[in-house]
Amino acid sequence: DVERTTCPPEKEVHEIDESLIFYKKRELEACVDAALLAAQMDRVDAIPFTYEQLDVLKHKLDELYPQGYPESVIRHLGHLFLKMSPEDIRKWNVTSLETLKALLKVSKGHEMSAQVATLIDRVVVGRGQLDKDTVDTLTAFCPGCLCSLSPERLSSVPPSVIGAVRPQDLDTCGPRQLDVLYPKARLAFQNMSGSEYFVKIRPFLGGAPTEDVKALSQQNVSMDLATFMKLRREAVLPLTVAEVQKLLGPHVEGLKVEEQHSPVRDWILKQRQDDLDTLGLGLQGGIPNGYLILDLSVREALS
């Protein structure tokens, strides 16, 4: 912590300007009035402060705003944003997309994924929902950041906004996030024709249930293996060999290359070997011919 000293009269600060770069840490602490700093935050980013000096300025703002900074200050943080922790950001209330853009630009190239995720979360809370303007801002200034939001926050996305989401924006989404986004995408694209629908729904299919995957297999979509591998394991396991063959079309030979990877490996283990042999790919590991499969869960339910 910066030790408290009295400000020498000749060092008194009446405005935030370049002369402050020559102040030692303790002089900044003693001589810069926090309210003045907050009022002239727009000047701070143009001044080449050292990281140590920025620590002092942050400390001043923290003392002035223990409950969190107002948006008028947040908007002009500039490189001071790099000093913020997720805990600091959690106290903020941000509604302006200009503020979000400014801070996303500053964070670029820095290891700030936790801070950025918290900032985006605060923007969604502040604006009440994940509206089209917010999604457009995220896709433009922070590809992949959409996936930093929790499933709970993503549930506030109206289906009408889904069209603004690009495949690369979903690249880092996990299964729980896609579970939330997929039904919205299905709704958003429901009036499209088969091939156009598949192109649009493809990035969201990691959240699709078995019945929807089965339905796709009847539509000659020729799903590529990259998409197939992103499907939920639970959605893939009930598919028959014939359904998978129809679903993948000419890409079916890719099963051989991926046979060691889940969900292909798990699916192979559930198929009859003679069914797998019909594919002519040399897939091994299916249930041997002549074996019976007993579903013990059904038997337990009956007893």
Partner: antibody, heavy 119, light 108 residues
């Protein structure tokens, strides 16, 4: 432009571990597996294993089992290959190479990372 | 594992001459699952041919591939100076994926 950029050369003592990174750019990271291939001085190519960046699932060449670990960081579009219990025979150039999921050929390669194991 | 044996190990060839490199597999390889790479000194390997006979993007048409089962061939129809390199065949028909030992082509 599609690029795979690997971390710099390493010199390690026998018994130590090395972790090589491979940063991808210019394509959808999760549509391609990342494989690792090594080449000892004056020798041929040897496949070590691969990772599916979408699921984090890995397959290793059994020759390296227990010694090699491949991981990914989707947010940074980066994969890592760590080789432990190094011996002098592990001196080689290590390449990452992308492979479109469902195919087995490597259409883009990293520049290679030289790992030297010497006491 | 499938062992891929390339021959010859080394070939010294005059420009404009035809070069044939063979890759023999210890057991059958599905032809969709064989590729060829070119590696020049101090460079990373480069994809030349995939699925036995398909030319990779940007590869000159003087390169071609053929074969099935256990015997595969890479042909350079009219060798050019820039083709001096080591060539590797590679299979992913069976786990673990393997490479041939390489054929070094030198310009006379």
């Amino acid at each position: 432009e599609v690029q795979l950029v690997q971390s710099g050369a390493e010199v390690k003592k026998p018994g130590a571990s090395v972790k090589v990174s491979c940063k991808a750019s210019g394509y959808t990271f999760t549509d391609y597996n990342m494989d690792w291939v090594r080449q000892a001085p004056g020798q041929g190519l040897e496949w070590m294993g691969d990772i599916n960046p979408s699921t984090g699932g890995t397959i290793y060449n059994q020759k390296f089992n227990g010694r090699v670990t491949m991981t990914e960081d989707k947010s940074a579009s980066t994969v890592y290959m760590e080789l432990s219990s190094l011996r002098s025979e592990d001196t080689a150039v290590y390449y990452c190479a992308r492979r479109r999921i469902g195919t087995g050929y490597f259409d883009v390669w990293g520049q290679g990372t030289t790992v030297t194991v010497s006491s | 594992e499938i062992v891929l044996t390339q021959s010859p190990d080394f070939q010294s060839v005059t420009p404009k001459e035809k070069v044939t490199i063979t890759c023999s597999a210890s057991s059958s390889v599905i032809s969709s699952y064989l590729s060829w790479y070119q590696q020049k000194p101090d460079q990373s390997p480069k994809l030349l041919i995939y699925r036995t006979s398909n030319l990779a993007s940007g590869v000159p048409s003087r390169f071609s591939g053929s074969g099935s089962g256990t015997d595969f061939t890479l042909t350079i129809n009219s060798l050019e100076a820039e083709d001096a390199a080591t060539y590797y065949c590679h299979q992913w028909s069976s786990f673990p994926y393997t490479f041939g030992g390489g054929t070094k082509v030198e310009i006379k």
